[in-house]
Interface confidence: low
């Protein structure tokens, strides 16, 4: 039975040209995290594997940095970065937990962070 909960940074916004940290946290489970995938819609951005460490998609390696922790830092943001991002936790023995973050990249200098929310 999957008892865990993923907390994410929720709906967030940032300025064009700036940086943003995508964060997820898995709680309420003793399951072992074997791998975390970060995906943007249908694209795999990065993998953090418990054995092998981080691997950033070479298509994004100039703009994506691993961390902090199991999070992901997006740099040099463009309006094309607006959209859904998913953290996918592969765990044993629970299985897969998925968290969703929506990022809006704004042209203006007004970029406010949304509230945190939980996905059971």
């Amino acid at each position: 039975m999957m008892t865990g909960t993923i907390e994410t940074t929720g709906n967030i916004s940032a300025e064009k040209g700036g940086s943003i940290i995508l964060q997820c946290h898995l709680s309420s489970t003793t399951a072992q995290v074997t791998q975390v995938n970060w995906e943007q819609q249908d694209q795999l951005l990065a993998i953090c594997n418990a054995d092998l460490g981080w691997h950033i998609s070479p298509s994004f390696k100039d703009r994506v940095a691993p961390g902090p922790g199991l999070g992901l830092t997006l740099q040099s943001l463009t309006v094309n970065d607006t959209g859904e991002y998913f953290c996918i936790y592969h765990t044993y023995p629970d299985g897969t937990y998925t968290g969703r973050i929506f990022l809006e990249v704004l042209e203006s200098s007004v970029a406010e962070h949304g509230a945190r929310f939980q996905i059971p």
Partner: nanobody, 117 residues
Framework: EVQLVESGGGLVQPGGSLRLSCAAS????????MGWFRQAPGKEREWVAS???????WYADSVKGRFTISADNSKNTAYLQMSSLKPEDTAVYYC???????????WGQGTLVTVSS
């Protein structure tokens, strides 16, 4: 001793297909990223594709939809299936073991792929 040996290159007509193989030894294959790179005459070596156990694969935009990378852990072999080949795919193709963070630490000797009519 780590060894990577590529094979499968050759001359192929535009629109044709080839499958490259990379036989690996001397390290734990199923706990490693494997990548394919290529170097065209007079150009720098460029990344083509990477694969991790479990089938996670990434591709350069120039080959997406035409090339497929895979790995057979039981044979310690990585493959690059190339289809709809174009003259600009002509290059020496190398396989490499990639460490964490996309740094390739071991390379094969390369296999030449020539796409020409």
């Amino acid at each position: 001793e780590v060894q990577l040996v590529e094979s499968g290159g050759g001359l192929v007509q535009p629109g044709g297909s080839l499958r490259l193989s990379c036989a690996a030894s001397g390290f734990t294959f199923d706990r490693s990223w494997m990548g394919w790179f290529r170097q065209a005459p007079g150009k720098e070596r460029e990344w083509v594709a990477s694969v991790l156990r479990g089938g996670y694969a990434w591709y350069a935009d120039s080959v997406k939809g035409r090339f497929t990378i895979s790995a057979d852990n039981s044979k310690n072999t990585a493959y690059l299936q190339m289809s709809s080949l174009k003259p600009e795919d002509t290059a020496v193709y190398y396989c490499a073991r990639e460490g964490s963070g996309y740094a390739s630490d071991y390379w094969g000797q390369g296999t030449l792929v020539t796409v020409s009519s």
